[in-house]
């Protein structure tokens, strides 16, 4: 039994970082595998985390690390029963994937306007909770160009936008993803997506 | 410095209740690991009592023999872990410890305490008419 | 629950010796495994977890082997301060129990 792909993790930076790797060949991971972390740090403990499957080959790791800082750095050891297959580190804060946003939602009755908003997927105290920057990507069920996204590099989780810039009459869909430029990150998940008719007056055209 | 200290021990009557207070200082006991009680009736050997999960899920696990009896709280502003013990009898008579655990887990809502790497030096409860 | 068995409940041994202890579960527990050595008055202090691995700060006199059911613990050179209890501490998360051996007291020949 050998690793094919190494682990790489990347961290939420909040409680969870999720590690993912390869085999070489089909691997019962919950059974076989078991993926040891333990923050460098004089009494820290070294956890057990039982890997799922990802694929045939693919092994997939939630590691539970709440009160992540900037200085944290982990060891880990993949073990196949006694055997260490793999040894490596894992330093959270430079490999940040944000929570997805929650929350999306489409507010049409503000004169013309739309109005989303969605939650900042992370609690005041946490670093990130005010170096968020979002896109927001909004198609057409109907017509597949109709695709558009919007950057939102504020720090309020909201996006104005004319409902004339949409075409009326039809269903339009919206979600929402965010990063840190701080952490350098990657993006975000995409949040679920919402759904509303969009419609709006034609303004009165005058010869 | 990282310890725990226990306090709330003493002499209670068969029948009896007594809350147990664990105090942790040196780290933050909102953090991923496990709170665990452990006694150790005189001259006898160590008997492990429940855990719960420091983090945000707060999940608890208790020895057969302690459920119903015995019930592990914390307050996480307070970083102190308590355990609440009920209908005492003469043979709950121990020094009783806090203890910070590892953990296994799989996924992020299934979370067992494993091994026991920082002790606190023990709290005696008697229990005597 | 699980059984752990540990056995000798007692020994005798000179500074020096080599000391095994083993403990027996009743159950396949994988290597989720510790051993702890406590001396009177004190609170028990962590040597070995996931049956082999050394604590921060402790000896390498001592070391750990097994897996599934059958644990031993070794002491290479006994030394005047390990004489001592040890237990050793077996975690079944499929019958969700953590259970301690009954001991093995180690007193100066």
């Known amino acids: 039994m050998k690793v094919l792909q190494e682990p790489t993790c990347v961290s939420d930076y909040m409680s969870i970082s999720t590690c993912e790797w390869k085999m070489n060949g089909p691997t019962n991971c919950s059974t076989e595998l078991r993926l040891l972390y333990q923050l460098v740090f004089l009494l820290s403990e070294a956890h057990t985390c039982i890997p799922e499957n990802n694929g045939g080959a693919g092994c997939v790791c939630h590691l539970l690390m709440d009160d992540v800082v900037s200085a944290d750095n982990y060891t880990l050891d993949l073990w196949a029963g006694q055997q260490l297959l793999w040894k490596g580190s894992f330093k959270p804060s430079e490999h940040v994937k944000p929570r997805a946003p929650g929350n999306l939602t489409v507010h049409t009755n503000v004169s013309d306007t739309l109005l989303l908003t969605w939650s900042n997927p992370y609690p005041p105290d946490n670093y990130l909770y005010n170096h968020l920057t979002y896109a927001v990507n909004i198609w057409s069920e109907n017509d597949p160009a109709d695709f558009r996204i919007y950057n939102v590099t504020y720090l309020e989780p909201s996006l104005r936008i004319a409902a004339s810039t949409l075409k009326s009459g039809i269903s339009y869909r919206a979600r929402v993803r965010a990063w840190a430029q701080c952490y350098n990150t990657t993006w975000s998940e995409w949040s679920p997506s919402t759904k509303w008719h969009n419609s709006y007056r034609e303004p009165f055209e005058q010869h | 410095e990282v310890q725990l200290v226990e306090s709330g021990g003493g002499l209670v009557q068969p029948g009896g209740s007594l809350r147990l207070s664990c105090a942790a200082s040196g780290f933050s006991s909102s953090s991923a690991h496990y709170m665990c009680w452990v006694r150790q009736a005189p001259g006898k050997g160590l008997e492990w009592i429940g855990c719960?999960?420091?983090?945000?899920?707060?999940?608890?696990y208790y020895a057969s023999w302690a459920k119903g009896r015995f019930t592990i709280s914390r307050d996480n502003s307070k970083n102190t872990v308590y355990l609440q013990m009920n209908s005492l009898r003469a043979e709950d008579t121990a020094v009783y410890y806090c203890a910070r655990a590892a953990f296994v887990n799989r996924g992020v809502s299934w979370i067992w305490p494993y091994y026991f790497s920082l002790w606190g030096q023990g709290t005696l409860v008697t229990v005597s008419s | 629950d699980i059984q752990m068995t540990q056995s000798p409940s007692s020994l005798s041994a000179s500074v020096g010796d080599r000391v095994t202890i083993t403990c027996q579960a009743s159950?396949?527990?994988?290597?989720?495994l510790a051993w702890y050595q406590q001396k009177p008055g004190k609170a028990p202090k962590l040597l070995i977890y996931r049956a082999s691995t050394l604590a921060y700060g402790v000896p390498s006199r001592f070391s750990g082997s097994g897996s599934g059911t059958d644990f031993t613990l070794t002491i290479s050179s006994l030394q005047p301060e390990d004489f001592a209890t040890y237990y050793c501490?077996?975690?079944?998360?499929?019958?969700?129990?953590?259970?301690f051996g009954q001991g093995t007291k180690v007193e100066i020949k």
């Open positions: 501490l077996g975690s079944s998360y499929s019958t969700g129990s953590n259970i």
């Open positions: 719960i999960y420091a983090g945000s899920r707060g999940s608890t």
């Open positions: 159950e396949d527990i994988e290597s989720y």
